[in-house]
């Protein structure tokens, strides 16, 4: 049987034409399911904001190796978390929309806290 | 739905060049990055190399670093890897992929080169 | 270049059993590794990326682990359809590398 048929499905349709500044970020999902129109990354805020980016773009590329670095140091594998942290605000200067499809993304937290957890992308339906 | 189909085998002599397709379906190549990964008879996978279609930029292997060239044209959703200098040891199928993160979700169904003289 | 160890480059094993193969890198990847599965005359197929992130329609007996330069995959249960070889690959930096791959074969 397939895995976890009713798991969600972000996808990106624009991306963001600002630099977030780094310190901002706490995490980020890689986008690559064919039922998106492109392969995108969306990163997650400390304040629980989405925010689609170019993953072809040289400041994406090196943000997201600095996060995984720092997910490392702290986190020595990928957990999951509620829904209700992705569900809390809108995405920032992009359209993003969420379907239902299996494992649509993996997102990876790079936050230090103890409590702190890997999330996945999240049915809002 | 996302297709790659590729260009039909090949039979080429030891130093000649051979250039294989792969044409996209079901998404637009400049969105991703088109790679080439091969795999000679009864062995692992070889990443080749990338192409950005959108801009052209591309990376290599550097062991493959001036014998091969990808390209793309994107009015046909196409890229293309050209190999040169034609050794026996080139014998694989060749495989174009899609994946902006470095790895494959996406693959063509193989060519089949065999060189020989 | 980043080198991937993967053991063991083949095994026998039954319907049911349990499988599990090894990855190593030579430095750390930070979890961007991917596993595939080829069956003969066919393209590679992604199961795994992430090192744990199943792909859609792969079925939940599969399942990857690991970080720094160690990774696994495991096949909880196997079925007639998982004879196959599997390779994993790191994604961290170019050139992208593949393990030797594993054959599972019937025992």
């Known amino acids: 049987q397939p895995d976890a048929v009713n798991a969600p499905l972000t996808c990106c349709y624009s991306f963001t034409s600002k630099m977030i500044p780094m310190s901002r970020l706490e995490s980020y999902k890689r986008i690559t399911s064919s039922r998106c129109p492109k392969e995108a990354v969306v990163f997650v805020t400390k304040l629980k904001r989405e925010v689609c980016a170019d993953p072809k773009k040289e400041w994406v590329q090196t943000y997201i190796k600095n996060l995984d670095r720092n997910q490392m140091r702290s986190e020595p594998t990928t957990l999951f978390k509620t829904a209700s942290a992705l569900r809390s605000s809108a995405p920032l200067n992009v359209k993003l929309t969420r379907k239902s499809e299996a494992n649509a993304s993996t997102t990876f937290s790079t936050t230090t806290s103890s409590t702190s957890v890997g999330v996945t992308s999240v049915t809002v339906n | 739905q996302v297709q790659l189909v590729q260009s039909g085998a090949e039979v080429k002599k030891p130093g000649s060049s051979v250039k294989v397709s792969c044409k996209a379906s079901g998404l637009t190549i400049s969105d991703t990055y088109m790679h080439w990964v091969r795999q000679a008879p009864g062995q692992g996978l070889e990443w080749m190399g990338r192409?950005?279609?959108?801009?052209?930029?591309?990376k290599f292997d550097p062991k493959f670093q001036g014998r091969v060239t990808i390209t793309a044209d994107t009015s046909t959703s196409t890229a293309y890897m050209e190999l040169s200098s034609l050794r026996s040891e080139d014998t694989a199928v060749y495989y174009c992929?899609?994946?902006?993160?470095?790895?494959?979700?996406?693959w063509g169904q193989g060519t089949t080169v065999t060189v020989s003289s | 270049d980043i080198q991937m160890t993967q053991s063991p480059s083949s095994l026998s094993a039954s319907v049911g059993d349990r499988v599990t193969i090894t990855c190593k890198a030579t430095?750390?990847?930070?979890?961007?590794l991917a596993w595939y599965q080829q069956k003969p005359g066919k393209a590679p197929k992604l199961l795994i990326s992430?090192?744990?992130s199943l792909e859609t329609g792969v079925p939940s007996r599969f399942s990857g682990s690991g970080s720094g330069t160690d990774y696994t995959l495991t096949i909880s249960s196997l079925q007639p359809e998982d004879f196959a070889t599997y390779y994993c690959?790191?994604?961290?930096?170019?050139?992208?590398?593949f393990g030797g791959g594993t054959k599972v074969e019937i025992k």
């Open positions: 430095e750390d990847i930070y979890n961007r």
């Open positions: 192409i950005d279609p959108a801009n052209g930029n591309t």
């Open positions: 992430g090192a744990t």
């Open positions: 992929a899609r994946g902006v993160f470095g790895f494959f979700d996406y």
């Open positions: 690959q790191q994604f961290w930096s170019a050139p992208y590398t």
